[in-house]
Interface confidence: low
């Protein structure tokens, strides 16, 4: 019969014949022959291959380097790579999460619109009229000014985006 020029899915062409690819989690030891099937071996500890393949070496699991602020989010298997994320208070610098940076803090006058996650930084927003923030924080939202009226007090000093209003007693001399 004519030697094949193309092979089925999960096969590869070598020496004019179709051999089975190794399944995910295994590497190629030897190609098939006219008489033998492809020989595959499982990947070792801390190695993986995530596709049907003819690789002679498995890939090393990614190392989540604590010196770069990384920790393991999901341990790798023989078929999947390790997934890294950042330590508390840090977020990934890229989708691949190869290193981390400290979460940004929102300065006084700004509040946290969205708290940072392992993959995204803090989002800050200016405190609108009626709200304030007097701290630099990665968690604090803008707080509403104190309502003097509900305490039967009057505003003695107006609030700003960085300071609360100052309440004081009612002027008793008014008719």
């Amino acid at each position: 019969p004519e030697p094949p020029t193309a092979c089925r899915e999960k096969q590869y062409l070598i020496n004019s014949q179709c051999c089975s690819l190794c399944q995910p989690g295994q590497k190629l030891v030897s190609d098939c022959t006219e008489f033998t099937e492809t020989e595959c071996l499982p990947c070792g500890e801390s190695e993986f291959l995530d596709t049907w393949n003819r690789e002679t070496h498995c890939h090393q699991h990614k190392y989540c380097d604590p010196n770069l602020g990384l920790r393991v989010q999901q341990k790798g298997t023989s078929e999947t790579d390790t997934i890294c994320t950042c330590e508390e208070g840090w977020h990934c610098t890229s989708e691949a999460c190869e290193s981390c940076v400290l979460h940004r803090s929102c300065s006084p006058g700004f509040g946290v619109k969205q708290i940072a996650t392992g993959v995204s930084d803090t989002i800050c927003e200016p405190c609108p009229v009626g709200f304030f923030s007097n701290v630099s924080s990665a968690f604090e939202k803008c707080h509403p000014w104190t309502s003097c009226e509900t305490k039967d007090l009057v505003v003695q000093q107006a609030g700003t985006n960085k300071t609360d209003v100052v309440c004081g007693p009612q002027d008793r001399l008014r008719a």
Epitope: Q60, K62, D65, N67, L68, S94, S99
Partner: nanobody, 120 residues
Framework: EVQLVESGGALAQPGGSLRLSCEAS????????MAWYRQGPGKPREMVAN???????YYADSVKGRFTLSREGARNTVYLQMNSLKPEDTAVYQC??????????????WGRGTQVTVSS
């Protein structure tokens, strides 16, 4: 064994400038990131800035706009230009090169550190 040699640490006035450099004693292949860390008196070590193999640079908020990181890839040299120095920048600055060794193992080289003191 590759050595990282740091230089440029000194006593500087507040508002002054310094340039730190870190050079590897041999070429390191498969560098993933080069970074400067610092450890101030009584403080934990923190990453100041790092630059990935794709030349993307990241800075800690405390140094953004004041410090600039650059590198010479061929020589595995990384520089930290420090401007508008503040007393709180006082620390031992350590160079770090994060790389993938043969066999795909990710490893680090660390320098011994260079002292930066900001004081009037």
């Amino acid at each position: 064994e590759v050595q990282l040699v740091e230089s440029g640490g000194a006593l500087a006035q507040p508002g002054g400038s310094l340039r730190l450099s870190c050079e590897a004693s041999a070429t390191i292949r498969s560098v993933n990131a080069m970074a400067w860390y610092r450890q101030g008196p009584g403080k934990p070590r923190e990453m100041v800035a790092n630059i990935t193999s794709g030349d993307t640079t990241y800075y800690a908020d405390s140094v953004k706009g004041r410090f600039t990181l650059s590198r010479e890839g061929a020589r595995n040299t990384v520089y930290l230009q420090m401007n508008s120095l503040k007393p709180e920048d006082t620390a031992v600055y350590q160079c770090n090169i994060h790389y993938t060794s043969t066999g795909g193992i990710r490893r680090d080289y660390w320098g011994r550190g260079t002292q930066v003191t900001v004081s009037s």
